[in-house]
């Protein structure tokens, strides 16, 4: 089982939409796939896919999940808020027929405030 996640870095404006994609591949077929999205180490959702369908369509605040065969799991955040900034990781595990698991690399999401004044203040507050 292999998991590829993208993009590595995503910068969006507050109130817009952010799309994170996880590509899950396995050489052999699977009956049930458990998937998980985490943000800064905390679980946002942990549904499974079986018979081509997700057991859950919601993932965290304003998060929507979709599965597109053969291999694409998409997390769409809409509308994006400042609280969505963070490090996202996609994890997958084949539960049936045999346990296999893998995780993607981090996607870092940066949300810029809608107010340019806030944006200047935020950038100015970085150390160094």
């Amino acid at each position: 089982l292999s998991v590829q996640q993208g993009p590595n870095l995503l910068q969006v404006r507050q109130g817009s939409q952010a799309t994170l994609v996880c590509q899950v591949d396995q050489a052999t077929a699977w009956e049930r796939l458990r998937v998980k999205w985490t943000k800064d180490g905390a679980i946002l959702c942990q549904p499974y896919i079986t018979n081509g369908s997700l057991s859950l369509g919601v993932c965290g605040p304003q998060g929507r999940l979709s599965w597109q065969a053969p291999s694409h799991l998409t997390l769409q955040l809409d509308p994006v808020s400042l609280n969505h900034s963070g490090a996202y990781v996609c994890w997958a595990a084949v539960e049936i027929p045999e346990l296999e698991e893998a995780e993607g690399n981090i996607t870092r999401l940066f949300v810029d405030p809608d107010d340019p004044t806030q944006n200047r203040n935020r950038i100015a507050s970085f150390p160094g």
Epitope: A27, A29, A69, P97
Partner: antibody, heavy 120, light 113 residues
Framework: QVQLQESGPGLVKPSQTLSLTCTVS??????????WSWIRQHPGKGLEWIGY???????YYNPSLKSRVTISVDTSKNQFSLKLSSVTAADTAVYYC????????????WGQGTLVTVSS | DIVMTQTPSSLPVTPGEPASISCLSS????????????LNWYLQKPGQSPKLLIY???TRLSGVPDRFSGSGSGTDFTLKISRVEAEDVGDYFC?????????FGDGTRLEIK
């Protein structure tokens, strides 16, 4: 260009262990998402999957051979190996190494094959 | 284990004529999760190792002549050659990768009449 090359003795005595090595060039066997495989073909017959080892080190064997098979990897030499114990004349075959990717599921690159004869 | 049954075992063909090889699996190779058939076709020319022709039942590998085509779904698959050429001689094998152990058909030997 990815190339695989089998090596090992062409003659093995009955009850002994058959040992073959596959050297991979043009590609690192530590690359994630790949299965390093062994397949054999009895003279004039079809193909039989022996087993493979995944990038993670996890092995998968054909149940018909599982009790006698060991597949391992030597990352420092970019090689993987097959050991088949307690051989009989029925193990006489051309042995191929090949690779398979999670993203495909087919055997993309094959070695040229090496004939191993089991005879005293 | 999934049993792959290939027919015919031998196929004499006149150059320029079409050829068809059947492969039946003992269980479905279609996944509702990935919407794929886990079925590949290989050609093994005399004295060579097998080479992939078709994957996922119907997708032709880049570089494979378009006279080769694969079709079918579930348990019933076909490899067709629209116009056989002399260089097409060899043994054709179907292979399933739906589950381990991976299994192959017994092969079809295509020969020129």
């Amino acid at each position: 260009q990815v190339q695989l090359q089998e090596s090992g003795p062409g003659l093995v005595k009955p009850s002994q262990t058959l040992s073959l090595t596959c050297t991979v060039s043009g590609f690192s066997i530590t690359t994630g998402g790949y299965y390093w495989s062994w397949i054999r073909q009895h003279p004039g017959k079809g193909l039989e999957w022996i087993g493979y080892i995944y990038t993670s080190g996890r092995t998968y064997y054909n149940p018909s051979l599982k009790s006698r098979v060991t597949i391992s990897v030597d990352t420092s030499k970019n090689q993987f190996s097959l050991k088949l114990s307690s051989v009989t004349a029925a193990d006489t075959a051309v042995y191929y190494c090949a690779d398979m990717a999670d993203k495909g599921g087919w055997f993309a690159y094959w070695g040229q094959g090496t004939l191993v004869t089991v005879s005293s | 284990d999934i049993v792959m049954t290939q027919t015919p075992s031998s196929l004499p063909v006149t150059p320029g004529e079409p050829a068809s090889i059947s492969c039946l699996s003992s269980q479905s190779l279609f996944s509702s999760n990935t919407k794929r058939n886990y079925l590949n076709w290989y050609l093994q020319k005399p004295g060579q190792s097998p080479k992939l022709l078709i994957y996922h039942a119907s997708t032709r590998l880049s570089g494979v002549p378009d006279r080769f085509s694969g079709s079918g779904s579930g348990t019933d698959f076909t490899l067709k050659i629209s116009r056989v050429e002399a260089e097409d001689v060899g043994d054709y094998f179907c292979q399933q990768h739906y589950e381990t152990p991976l299994t192959f058909g017994d092969g079809t030997r295509l020969e020129i009449k």
